[in-house]
C-alpha cells in the first residue's frame, strides 16, 4: 500500500468506536483506530476521511463528524461532543465556550436582542445556573493531527476549534 | 449523472506496457474511491486494486504488486491503470469502478480490451 | 481473502419462472453482500447492495436475503431481459472479493 496512512494506536475507546460502527458494522475484522475526523473503512483496509462520506448513506460511520460539519454550517450554532448535538449560542451566551464568542458578544452589544435573563446579567443580576456554569469552562481543543490517509485534508483554526470541542 | 468512460481497446506485444484511462463524470471526482477489476475471457471478476484521487493513495491486491500502476489527473477527473510487462496472461478486459462507501461499486466504465500477442 | 462460492455456476429458465442463485462467504460477513448482473460485451451492473437492497433503477422482482455466510439473490418472475450472469461480491473485508458467477440461460 501507498500513500493511504495507516491507523493509529490507542485512539480510541471503544464505547466510541461502538457508536462509530453500530449494530456490529463490518464484523469480521478488527476495529482500527483513526483520528478523529476519519473513520476505518474496511473494506479498503485503511483509515479515511469522513468528509467523503458525509453525504451517503454510509455516514452514520461518521455520525458525530458530519453531524458537527452540517451544524457548523448554522450560523449561531456549535457542535457539542460531550452532548453530542448542535447547540444553540443564543441559549448560552453569558457562560459560552469560544465557538460562540463571536455570536455572543455580538448580542451583548445589541441588548435589545437578548432575552430577559441576558439583559438581567449585563446589568448585574447573574442568576446562579449550577447546571450550566462550569460546563463551558475552560474549554480548549486539544488540536488538529494531521491526517495520515489524506494528508491534504487539513482544519482551519476555526474548524478545529468545532470539530475538538 | 454518474458516467464512467473508458479508453479503447489496445493490442500489444508481449513486454509492453500500456495504459488504461477512465474519465469520470457527474460527481465530485476527489470524493470517491476507484477500483479496477478485471476480467479475462470467459471468466468471472478479479478485484486489481484501488486509488483514492484525494491523495493518489493506492493499494493493490497482492497477485498485482509490481504490474499494475494506478494514477490520476485531478484537473481531467481522469484515472489511469498501467499494466507493465505484459504477458498473455495480461489479456482481458479491464473496468473501473466507483466505491460508494457501502461496501458495493456502484457505477463501473464500459470496459477496455487489452489484447497482448506476438 | 474471504472465498465466495456461488451455485449454480449455470441455470436454463423460462419467462415467468421464479429463481434462486446461492451465494457462500468463507467467513462471517454480516450482511455486506453484493449482487452484480452482467450481459455479454457489457460492464457489470450493480443490482443490489447490504444484501437486500436495491439499486436504483433496478426492478422490484428482484430480491436478497441471507446473513453472516449464506445469501441468496431472488427474481420472482423471469423477464428477457434478465438472461445474464450474475456475481456475488463481498463488501465486509478488505480486499473485495467476488464469487465465480452464474449464467442464467433460456431453457
Known amino acids: 500500500m501507498s500513500g493511504l496512512g495507516r491507523s493509529r494506536r490507542g485512539g480510541r475507546s471503544r464505547v466510541d468506536q461502538e457508536e462509530r460502527f453500530p449494530q456490529g458494522l463490518w464484523t469480521g475484522v478488527a476495529m482500527r483506530s483513526c483520528p478523529e475526523e476519519q473513520y476505518w473503512d474496511p473494506l479498503l483496509g485503511t483509515c479515511m476521511s469522513c468528509k467523503t462520506i458525509c453525504n451517503h448513506q454510509s455516514q452514520r460511520t461518521c455520525a458525530a463528524f458530519c453531524r458537527s460539519l452540517s451544524c457548523r454550517k448554522e450560523q449561531g450554532k456549535f457542535y457539542d461532543h460531550l452532548l453530542r448535538d448542535c447547540i444553540s449560542c443564543a441559549s448560552i451566551c453569558g457562560q459560552h465556550p469560544k465557538q460562540c464568542a463571536y455570536f455572543c458578544e455580538n448580542k451583548l452589544r445589541s441588548p435589545v436582542n437578548l432575552p430577559p435573563e441576558l439583559r438581567r446579567q449585563r446589568s448585574g443580576e447573574v442568576e446562579n445556573n449550577s447546571d450550566n456554569s462550569g460546563r463551558y469552562q475552560g474549554l480548549e481543543h486539544r488540536g488538529s493531527e494531521a491526517s495520515p490517509a489524506l494528508p491534504g485534508l487539513k482544519l482551519s483554526a476555526d474548524q478545529v476549534a468545532l470539530v475538538y470541542s | 449523472q454518474v458516467q464512467l468512460v473508458q479508453s479503447g481497446a489496445e493490442v500489444k506485444k508481449p513486454g509492453a506496457s500500456v495504459k488504461v484511462s477512465c474519465k469520470a463524470s457527474?460527481?465530485?471526482?476527489?470524493?470517491?474511491?476507484m477500483h479496477w477489476v478485471k476480467q479475462k475471457p470467459g471468466q468471472g471478476l478479479e478485484w486489481m486494486g484501488y486509488i483514492l484521487p484525494y491523495n493518489d493513495g493506492t493499494k493493490y491486491a497482492q497477485k498485482f504488486q509490481g504490474k499494475v500502476t494506478m494514477t490520476s489527473d485531478k484537473s481531467t477527473s481522469t484515472v489511469y491503470m498501467e499494466l507493465s510487462s505484459l504477458t498473455s496472461e495480461d489479456t482481458a478486459v479491464y473496468y473501473c469502478a466507483r466505491y460508494d462507501y457501502e461496501g458495493s461499486f456502484d457505477y463501473w466504465g464500459q470496459g477496455t480490451l487489452v489484447t497482448v500477442s506476438s | 481473502d474471504i472465498q465466495m462460492t456461488q451455485s449454480p455456476s449455470s441455470l436454463s429458465a423460462s419467462v415467468g419462472d421464479r429463481v434462486t442463485i446461492t451465494c457462500r462467504a468463507s467467513?462471517?460477513?454480516?450482511?455486506?453482500l453484493n449482487w452484480y448482473q452482467q450481459k455479454p460485451g457489457k460492464a457489470p451492473k450493480l443490482l443490489m447492495c447490504?444484501?437486500?437492497r436495491l439499486h436504483s433503477g433496478v426492478p422490484s422482482r428482484f430480491s436478497g436475503s441471507g446473513s453472516g455466510t449464506d445469501f441468496t439473490l431472488t427474481i420472482s418472475s423471469l423477464e428477457q431481459e434478465d438472461f445474464a450472469t450474475y456475481y456475488c461480491q463481498q463488501g465486509n473485508t478488505f480486499p473485495p472479493t467476488f464469487g465465480g458467477g452464474t449464467k442464467v440461460e433460456i431453457k
Open positions: 457527474g460527481y465530485t471526482f476527489t470524493n470517491y474511491v
Open positions: 447490504y444484501t437486500s
Open positions: 467467513q462471517d460477513i454480516s450482511n455486506y
